[in-house]
Interface confidence: low
């Protein structure tokens, strides 16, 4: 008798590995024999599709080599014209051993920046990703994290982060390892030991010592009064990423010697400088009885700060005063390093006017020091924080050269404009035109007790303080 189709073995969920065989069975009882069709995600599977094998009158569907994209719902439908068609459905879950689709690559990074080593994976179940540094599992911390993507992110990269890394992707089916990659941490050139200043007798031998570090190891060059060192012997040694350079000199004239450490990061260079002065005891320039002369400023560093066509005092204790004083300003500015936007113009004005002092021409050219009030204004009002840092470094002996002592005046030793207004110079860059500015803060103050004035960029402005302003 005719009998409507009945599916005696309903389809079940099938788990299959990629590239393996997966079979769905759809056992049907009916008379006459039914026609059995198969669908995947409601799309008919064609009988001639070579990726599939359909056997046992359509009751067995075999996927010959499972691919990741074969995931889905498979249904068999049986129909023999007696009664209605019947259907049974089951899922294919494609299981996949972990696979690293985007492995990490070698990275060169500058210390302090952020490094990301990629490690993108595939797999079902989703693999967990961990990292190995050297031979040990890598521990996450506030700087080091494995991202959701599997990539390794290192904030504020440190020297000790350098090394060999590999990522490991793991699920219940297996483990995949990436190839080993190298993280190289580069470090800007930094001077560890600055050359020391010397006061020696004519004809002495002096050895200047400069030590620097960085990754890659920097090279050291020596500059004498702004030019390449013309005489003297240089000995160098490198150990544990530290370069040690010794410049031996036969002293016949005073000079400013600068050690410049340079290293390369890709196409860019980083440099660090430190300088030392060599002065000669009892030194005086031939045919000059005085200690200096007046000349118009022709340099660059202080161009925007000094008054146009200003007569400045050039100190003949240097072999080439213009060059030496210019380099002194430049080096001093580098030594001051980071200052706030409020401090910068004031500090520049102070440095330039202190090193290139106003000059009073005459039979004996005389330098005119900065008025104490202006020095205090910079120290207490504009650069309180920076000044404290610098003084602290001086006390702790962190300045190896005496450069900063030459370039930053000691306010208390400067003449006050209240004593003799012509005996000291005003800083053209500090223009106190605030109506409410009555007094400067006391010496003990660590922050301004008055408004911080605007700092005009015009060098023609003048510092107008009435004699009634009290100073501490």
């Amino acid at each position: 008798l005719p009998k409507a189709p009945v599916i005696t073995t309903p389809l079940e969920t099938v788990d299959a590995l990629v590239e393996e065989v997966a079979t769905f069975m759809c056992a049907v009882e009916s008379y006459p024999q039914p026609e059995i069709s198969w669908t995947r995600n409601k799309i008919l599977i064609k009988l001639f599709d070579t990726r599939y094998s359909i056997r046992e009158n359509g009751q067995l569907l075999t996927i010959l080599s499972v691919e990741d994209s074969d995931d889905g719902i498979y249904c068999c439908t049986a129909n023999n014209g007696v009664g209605g068609a019947v259907e049974s459905c089951g899922a294919l879950q494609v299981k996949m051993k972990p696979k690293i689709t985007r492995p990490p690559i070698n990275v060169k990074i500058i210390e302090g920046l952020k490094a990301v080593l990629p490690c993108t994976t595939m797999g079902n179940p989703k693999p967990s990703v961990s990292w190995i540094k050297g031979d040990s599992p890598l521990r996450e911390n506030s700087r080091i994290a494995v991202l959701e993507s599997g990539s390794l992110r290192i904030h504020n990269v440190q020297k000790e982060d350098a090394g060999q890394y590999r990522c490991v992707a793991k699920n219940s089916l297996g483990t995949a390892y990436s190839k080993v990659v190298k993280l190289e941490v580069e470090v800007f050139a930094r001077i560890l030991r600055a050359p020391e200043s010397h006061n020696v007798t004519f004809g002495s031998f002096v050895t200047l010592h400069c030590t620097a570090t960085g990754i890659p190891v920097p090279t050291i060059t020596w500059i004498e009064n702004g030019n390449a060192v013309s005489s003297g012997s240089i000995q160098e040694s490198v150990k544990d990423r530290v370069i040690d350079s010794r410049l031996q000199l036969f002293i016949t004239k005073p000079g400013l010697y600068t050690c410049i450490a340079t290293n390369k990061h890709g196409e860019k260079f980083s440099t660090a400088k430190a300088a030392a002065t060599i002065s000669i005891a009892e030194w005086s320039k031939p045919q000059k009885d005085n200690k200096g002369y007046c000349a118009q400023y022709r340099g660059e560093v202080c161009n925007a700060v000094l008054a146009k066509d200003a007569l400045v005092f050039l100190n003949t204790s240097y072999a080439d005063p213009e060059e030496a004083q210019e380099l002194l300003v430049h080096t001093a500015w580098n030594e001051l390093k980071v200052v706030s936007p409020v401090c910068r113009p004031a500090a520049e004005a102070l440095l330039c006017n202190h090193i290139f002092q106003e000059c009073s021409p005459g039979v004996v050219p005389t330098p005119i020091p900065i008025c104490r009030e202006y020095c205090l204004a910079v120290k207490e009002l504009f650069c309180a924080k920076e000044w404290l840092v610098m003084e602290e470094k001086t006390h702790r002996g962190l300045y190896r050269s005496e450069m900063h002592l030459l370039s930053v005046p000691e306010c208390s030793k400067l003449p006050s404009m209240h004593w003799d207004p012509t005996a000291c110079a005003r800083l053209p860059h500090l223009d106190y035109n605030k109506e409410n500015l009555k007094t400067f803060p006391p010496m003990t103050s660590s922050k301004p007790s008055v408004d911080i004035p605007n700092l005009p960029s015009s060098s023609s402005s003048s510092f107008s303080v009435s004699p009634t302003y009290s100073m501490t």
């Epitope: 302090g112 920046l113 800007f188 860019k268 980083s270 980071v338 936007p341 660590s446 922050k447």
Partner: antibody, heavy 129, light 107 residues
């Protein structure tokens, strides 16, 4: 005169996108960081994102990570905030602000350390169906 | 994330009063703290940066100080134009956070 001018705000449906612009003038854009800060009606200030114009490095508040993107075009002195998948809780006045950064030992430092000294007038973003 | 807990959330004071607003950081933020003043419908204005540095053009009655992770904004003698909302902000980490604000109202 220093100016920051925001534009691009408006009404958008949940799930939609907007791109805010912040045109800067009167200061060195390259040595600045640009920040986006928002303020929901009647609420306090909430930092959204920052970019260092010089290095291009960015950071985002957790509430917008993955949905918002900050960028800067130094040739145009302009910063942008691309906002995708907007939600009702993103409704706020969006301010752009700048802070001074400085070049020191080969890196740009101080983003935010010197305070956000200049602010725009703000642009209103309303997310509503 | 570093939380900035600002107190009080509001206060009433009279002209001439000394006003103190405090912010406590949930962890060390060095001196990377700024203070802002905001009036209704206006953008915030920077008052103090680096914990204690007075911003250019800000009256000297405003001052900032730091003690460990506690930061204080002080208005030595409240003026009529000082009635506003004040916010602290830290930028020690790359994730900047603001305090919830303190509204200074007329008593």
């Amino acid at each position: 005169e220093v100016q920051l001018v925001e534009s691009g705000g408006g009404l958008v449906q949940p799930g939609g996108s907007l791109r805010l612009s912040c045109a800067a003038s009167g200061f060195t854009f390259y040595s600045s960081s640009i920040h986006w800060v928002r303020q929901a009606p009647g609420k306090g200030l909430e930092w959204v994102a920052s970019i260092s114009s010089s290095s291009g490095s960015t950071s985002y508040a957790d509430s917008v990570k993955g949905r918002f993107t900050i960028s800067a075009d130094t040739s145009k002195n302009t910063a942008y905030l691309q906002m995708n998948s907007l939600r009702a809780e993103d409704t706020a006045v969006y301010y752009c602000a700048r802070s001074y950064t400085m070049f020191y030992y080969g890196g740009w430092y101080g983003s935010g350390y010197f305070g956000m000294d200049y602010w725009g007038q703000g642009t209103l973003v309303t997310v509503s169906s | 994330d570093i939380q900035m807990t600002q107190s009080p959330s509001s206060l009433s004071a009279s002209v001439g009063d000394r006003v103190t607003i405090t912010c406590r950081a949930s962890q060390s933020v060095s001196s990377a703290v700024a203070w802002y003043q905001q009036k209704p419908g206006k953008a915030p204005k920077l008052l103090i940066y680096s914990a204690s540095s007075l911003y250019s053009g800000v009256p000297s009655r405003f001052s900032g100080s730091r003690s460990g992770t506690d930061f204080t904004l002080t208005i030595s003698s409240l003026q009529p134009e000082d009635f506003a909302t004040y916010y602290c902000q830290q930028s020690s980490s790359s994730l900047i956070t603001f305090g919830q604000g303190t509204k200074v109202e007329i008593k």
